[in-house]
């Protein structure tokens, strides 16, 4: 139901892209967009499962929480949410499951209070490097974003551009160093094979990082050293075989960290010795008693915490003269 509102602010713009993006007339005070439900008391607008093909132009200026889930938006252009009067207090925006395949540079410009953004479950074949920074400057104005939810945004194989999906996402996260204040980043279920080594160092405010249900094989080149505020690191359901000494030491050095490592195919050979020793001593791994070996076959389902050095052997490498073809 729609209810009356008095706008707290007014907006004007000289930005050229706003000519088409901004509704010509300010919305009526009590207006609620067609196919949406509005509550001024809760400062919330819900346009959910309505097959909308574009963002409504007549969103009420009071909105703080906007749900645009389950639609068919396809593309978010520059200034997709720029309005007159502005959405000056829009703080939480959920666009999940709206069939977005392209998010353009400056899509979230003129949302100065946007703290939480959820783009999950959209096949983002084309995420502009400047989707979140809004500018191609080497150092852009800082983004107000605190939480960025990007779970399951990987497009089908045949729709991917001829480039690394990981690289495309990371470019958007790092552009202009705009996301220095980001505290929660969720990147679950994206088929990530690797994590580019520079991404975490440039997100120093992170408290929560979710990389679960990807295809990460190794963290060897990933540094957690700068993430002194990190409280939770979700690495469940990946393809991790072992964590090496450098990674173990960095994780142990984070003062508030909780690490989740369930459902990885741990290889319990001689390279696992350091990790087993660490697991027995550390308090940072949640549910560490559930971690089990996947390989080699003889070790399958053995609990890591119950292993000792005698269990962790490697088949000897024969010198060349003794090898057979």
């Amino acid at each position: 139901s729609s209810s009356p509102t008095s706008s707290a602010s007014s907006f004007s713009s000289s930005a050229p892209f706003l000519a088409s993006a901004v509704s010509a007339q300010p919305p009526l005070p009590d207006q609620c967009p067609a196919l949406c439900e509005c509550s001024e008391a809760a400062r919330t607008v819900k346009c959910v499962n309505r097959n909308l093909t574009e963002v409504p132009t007549d969103l009420p200026a009071y909105v703080r929480n906007l749900f645009l889930t389950g639609n068919q938006l396809a593309v978010l252009p520059a200034g997709a949410f720029a309005r007159r009067p502005p959405l000056a207090e829009l703080a939480a925006l959920n666009l999940s499951g709206s069939r977005l395949d392209e998010v353009r540079a400056g899509a979230f410009e003129h949302l100065p209070s946007l703290r939480q953004l959820d783009l999950s479950h959209n096949p983002l074949a084309d995420l502009s490097p400047f989707a979140f920074s809004g500018s191609n400057a080497s150092v852009s104005a800082p983004s107000p974003l605190v939480e960025l939810i990007l779970n399951h945004i990987v497009p089908p194989e045949d729709e991917r551009q001829n480039r690394s999906f990981e690289g495309m996402v990371v470019a958007a996260l790092l552009a202009g160093r705009a996301l220095q204040g980001l505290r929660r980043l969720e990147l679950a279920s994206n088929h990530f094979l690797y994590l580019p080594r520079d991404v975490l160092a440039q997100l120093p405010s992170l408290r929560h990082l979710d990389l679960s249900n990807n295809s990460l094989v190794s963290l060897t080149y990933v540094s957690f050293r700068n993430l002194t505020h990190l409280e939770s690191l979700h690495l469940e359901d990946n393809a991790l075989k072992v964590l090496h000494n450098g990674t173990l030491a960095e994780l142990q050095g984070l003062p508030h960290i909780r690490v989740f490592l369930d459902n990885n195919p741990w290889v319990c050979d001689c390279h696992m010795a350091d990790m087993v020793t660490w697991l027995k001593e550390t308090e940072v791994v949640q549910g560490k008693d559930r971690l089990t070996c996947a390989y080699p076959e003889k070790m399958r389902n053995r609990v890591l915490l119950e292993l000792n050095s005698a269990d962790l052997d490697c088949d000897p490498i024969l010198p060349p003269s003794l090898q057979t073809s």
Partner: antibody
Framework: EVQLLESGGGLVQPGGSLRLSCAAS????????MSWVRQAPGKGLEWVSS????????YYADSVKGRFTISRDNSKNTLYLQMNSLRAEDTAVYYC??????????????WGQGTLVTVSS | DIQMTQSPSSLSASVGDRVTITCRAS??????LNWYQQKPGKAPKLLIY???SLQSGVPSRFSGSGSGTDFTLTISSLQPEDFATYYC?????????FGQGTKLEIK
């Protein structure tokens, strides 16, 4: 050293107009969002208006919307507040203030010394 | 709009005292709160941002705490120059809203 210097205040009759200016120095003005905040005699602080660093977005309190216009000239390092249809309740010291670089949280890290606007017949 | 409510509205204390001023937001603002000090005839000065971070040049006797809706400004040992009015401000939204102020006076 960051400096903000307001000017343009004075005595004006109800219904009249004034234009306040704020000259900025000691920092990159074109990269900073700016704001006007006012304080009626013996009262607390009231936000009036804000403008993006680029000038592309302007925001107003309900109490001044449609009467006041904020603008900036980045080539002159100057912020403006055009005040029309002034009312007695607009009487206050008007401060210009700079938004800090840290938007987590938004804060006003430097303020001018203020200029007094008196609306009276 | 978010309402910011400070208490007390005025407070008398002596040099050397420990003083606490509280600020409550009408909705959660995480740790996105700032504190300002204003002396008579002067502009406000930013003291603390992000609830507990001291602005450069501010003496360490000032400290802030809190998260969500309830916040506190503490002056551990009052100095003569600390007698002033203190304002809290929410910085979660781009458009600032201030508390009504707490006037700290000499007893």
């Amino acid at each position: 050293e960051v400096q903000l210097l307001e000017s343009g205040g004075g005595l004006v009759q109800p219904g009249g107009s004034l234009r306040l200016s704020c000259a900025a120095s000691g920092f990159t003005f074109s990269g900073s969002s700016m704001s006007w905040v006012r304080q009626a005699p013996g009262k607390g602080l009231e936000w009036v208006s804000s403008i993006y660093y680029s000038g592309s977005g302007t925001y107003y309190a309900d109490s001044v919307k449609g009467r006041f216009t904020i603008s900036r000239d980045n080539s002159k390092n100057t912020l403006y507040l055009q005040m029309n249809s002034l009312r007695a309740e607009d009487t206050a010291v008007y401060y210009c203030a700079r938004y800090g670089r840290n938007v987590h949280p938004y804060n006003l890290d430097y303020w001018g010394q203020g200029t007094l606007v008196t609306v009276s017949s | 709009d978010i309402q910011m409510t400070q208490s007390p509205s005025s407070l008398s204390a002596s040099v050397g005292d420990r003083v606490t001023i509280t600020c409550r937001a009408s909705q959660s603002i995480s740790s996105y709160l700032n504190w300002y000090q204003q002396k008579p005839g002067k502009a406000p000065k930013l003291l603390i941002y992000a609830a507990s971070s001291l602005q450069s040049g501010v003496p360490s006797r000032f400290s802030g705490s809190g998260s969500g809706t309830d916040f506190t400004l503490t002056i551990s040992s009052l100095q003569p120059e600390d007698f002033a009015t203190y304002y809290c401000q929410q910085g979660y939204y781009y458009l600032p809203t201030f508390g009504q102020g707490t006037k700290l006076e000499i007893k």
